[in-house]
Interface confidence: low
Amino acid sequence: ARWFPKTLPCDVTLDVPKNHVIVDCTDKHLTEIPGGIPTNTTNLTLTINHIPDISPASFHRLDHLVEIDFRCNCVPIPLGSKNNMCIKRLQIKPRSFSGLTYLKSLYLDGNQLLEIPQGLPPSLQLLSLEANNIFSIRKENLTELANIEILYLGQNCYYRNPCYVSYSIEKDAFLNLTKLKVLSLKDNNVTAVPTVLPSTLTELYLYNNMIAKIQEDDFNNLNQLQILDLSGNCPRCYNAPFPCAPCKNNSPLQIHDNAFNSLTELKVLRLHSNSLQHVPPTWFKNMNKLQELDLSQNFLAKEIGDAKFLHFLPSLIQLDLSFNFELQVYRASMNLSQAFSSLKSLKILRIRGYVFKELKSFNLSPLHNLQNLEVLDLGTNFIKIANLSMFKQFKRLKVIDLSVNKISPSGDSSEVGFCSNARTSVESYEPQVLEQLHYFRYDKYARSCRFKNKEASFMSVNESCYKYGQTLDLSKNSIFFVKSSDFQHLSFLKCLNLSGNLISQTLNGSEFQPLAELRYLDFSNNRLDLLHSTAFEELHKLEVLDISSNSHYFQSEGITHMLNFTKNLKVLQKLMMNDNDISSSTSRTMESESLRTLEFRGNHLDVLWREGDNRYLQLFKNLLKLEELDISKNSLSFLPSGVFDGMPPNLKNLSLAKNGLKSFSWKKLQCLKNLETLDLSHNQLTTVPERLSNCSRSLKNLILKNNQIRSLTKYFLQDAFQLRYLDLSSNKIQMIQKTSFPENVLNNLKMLLLHHNRFLCTCDAVWFVWWVNHTEVTIPYLATDVTCVGPGAHKGQSVISLDLYTCELDLTN
């Protein structure tokens, strides 16, 4: 028997190892806490709803609660949705939480609260009150939080949630929180470091405030502190995509020479966007455990050439010096201090936005002996000249990132390597990075309403490429021609990203010849001309090739396209040729004895497979090992007969989504003996097969969402015992009969999706209503989105909550 009602509009999961019962009611349009929450619930999430108040009755009987996530039920107006503004702040009645003796974590962010709630249980270890209207912190309001370990008070007073007053913190307000480990006061217009802070702190977040000076004693007793973030105080405002106020006279954050003396355990120090011009070594004299130092978005271009402070950082693993360029200066080359050579533990070095013209081998000489270095990021530097051969010194690197530069090929085969004749006016070198906001985000660690954990801030490296090994990222440069000498001495590379360049040459199989170990080549967003079937054949170990978004020559008539180039790539596993508008091919078939995955989205198979033209029906047939074929978005309103006969023999996954298919030859699936997944979503199909099992005995996953299916055939799933996943969501299904859905088949399903249909909840639906109420099959959104369109009184009602006992109930046959 089920231990919670199916009418509960929430997802219930068990975390057996942790002995947790998790109830997630995120974004369910709730205006009250739903009934039927299991009494043994430990983790309850009610974020993104419209519940106006919390009272002692709200969690009555939920005595086992360990965590309540009640965020974003009344988001401050500037932060919230403009079409659903919350004008009455969340009301929390006295003693609402006091009976929850096991409660450890309480998230109340985004509720327009004016003060820290009172009557909290002593068990509480984490309290999060971000994005409210709390801008006065008094000692008396914190007295109940004796056992608190994590306290988030950020985003209560900043440009997106203004408070129009000075944020005030009473002296010693936090001192009695003797178990406090994590304190966040970020994004709050705080003007000074609150003192005295408890010595138990391990993490202190004071970023994006209005602190102009760090005093000698501010962190005096914090000898357990591991993370300190002071970023965004006295910010560097150039090109900031948010309202930004620098300190007076653009002065840097003033930090007393001894301010960090007590921070002997510090591992992470973030001083991003503090307008720093110098970094005194004395700051770091007691910081020999520091592993991560962020000095990005300052004015440290000159300091990078001196940088004596680096000698004090033997444990440093990650160093970020990005976007420290001097305004209106375009340097000839990069000047790295010899002190970089002392960073023996360094794994990641990022120097984007230094802005210089030529990358020379000796520029990187201080890094040559850094044996642990894994990532060297020199993206967005407007480099025009770079001899890539210099990277033979960095064979141990996992990632060499030169993306978003202005590198282009040299005019001859001399040792100059890549160069450019692009214009050199300084105005064109202002970093244009708003598309990939990392260094230019106001708060890159901000949480959204949907997730409790902070958002990850990824860098641009293509992770699927990176996992193959040593990576060189040359994406978004100005390369219009490649030749083998460009890649001399780079035989160690496993992944090369050339995406987003201007390469329009006819590759003949010689250009990448030195890259003997290359496994992954991203050639997307170029202008590939497939004149030769020998293209890429020199890459003997190539496993993944992405030539997506190379539509330029495919869009022109009369041009030779040798799609059979795959024949020569003996170990190619995956080929992506999406969004190429391919409508013609000189070769009739593609051939490969290794290819397992082909992505062919966004092309014009409708033209290649035009009615009456059988020449290309076997285009994919000789991809003998092909298991996955994605031919979605190919404008295929119908499939000509012979298409399935021309499919590769081992095909397991076939996607025909987003094609505008009006009909489908279900019987032809018999040709695909190994087919396990068929995706026909986002088409215009109106019918399902008479009997699926007559069409395929192997099909496990059938995806028919977003079609125009109005009814299911009488024996649709009869004998389809292999089926495990069926998605019929977002169709126009009005009725499901017992014969269409035999229970001996349905009970094998791991997942059945039925939401967003047009169920008619008449007495004819009585079996269906009974079945959804009794089945153990997982039906997502059952309580909220499997609803009736009629008749009358039932409109909008959940199928699961229908009372059809007035109908004659006969479930025997």
Epitope: N369, Q371, N372, E374, K395, R396, L397, K398, Q470
Partner: antibody, heavy 125, light 107 residues
Framework: EVKLVESGGGLVQPGGSLRLSCTTS????????MEWVRQPPGKRLEWIAA??????????EYSASVKGRFIVSRDTSQNILYLQMNALRAEDTAIYYC????????????????WGAGTTVTVSS | DIVMTQSHKFMSTSVGDRVSITCKAS??????VAWYQQKPGQSPKLLIY???TRHTGVPDRFTGSGSGTDYTLTISSVQAEDLALYYC?????????FGGGTKLEIK
Amino acid sequence: EVKLVESGGGLVQPGGSLRLSCTTSGFTFSDFYMEWVRQPPGKRLEWIAASRNKRNDHTTEYSASVKGRFIVSRDTSQNILYLQMNALRAEDTAIYYCARDADYYGSSTWYFDVWGAGTTVTVSS
Amino acid sequence: DIVMTQSHKFMSTSVGDRVSITCKASQDVRTAVAWYQQKPGQSPKLLIYWASTRHTGVPDRFTGSGSGTDYTLTISSVQAEDLALYYCQQHYNTPPTFGGGTKLEIK
């Protein structure tokens, strides 16, 4: 074929000394961290010492139980790893294995992909 | 030092069975756990590292899993030649430390 062969084990009195050797072949010796791991009778494996690779200056690291008594070194010309054991105690009785760190692009992984067959050291009066 | 605990010193199984050997670390070792197999009279042989990555040449019936402090080595279908001692080892922090071993016996 990668091979590690230990030698030099034997019976020694408490307070005595012994030098173990590990002769290696089949790989570039100086590119790899090399480790000594021992296994006392009926007890768990215990890492005792490491000699870092050339890129890390062949520096050394020891467990607390042997620090100050044992010295690890290597002869890169002959591809031999040594363990000089001084002030031996009864609790040093074990099979001593030479092992190669798995190596990740020149960095230590602290797990070991190749092991020798071991040599037995008995400390007893 | 990080202590690795293998609570079962012995485990008895039959050929063809699925067996799981567990290991607990005294602190979070961030999936930096290796597993070794040691057959009688032989030296240890690396099976798994980073909790779940199979070493070259190791049969795919051996799989590793886990995170935080709890780790498991699973043999999906035990073969006679799998009779051996199995050790876990953390490679998160120096010194690297080993579990006490679990001896797999074939019934």
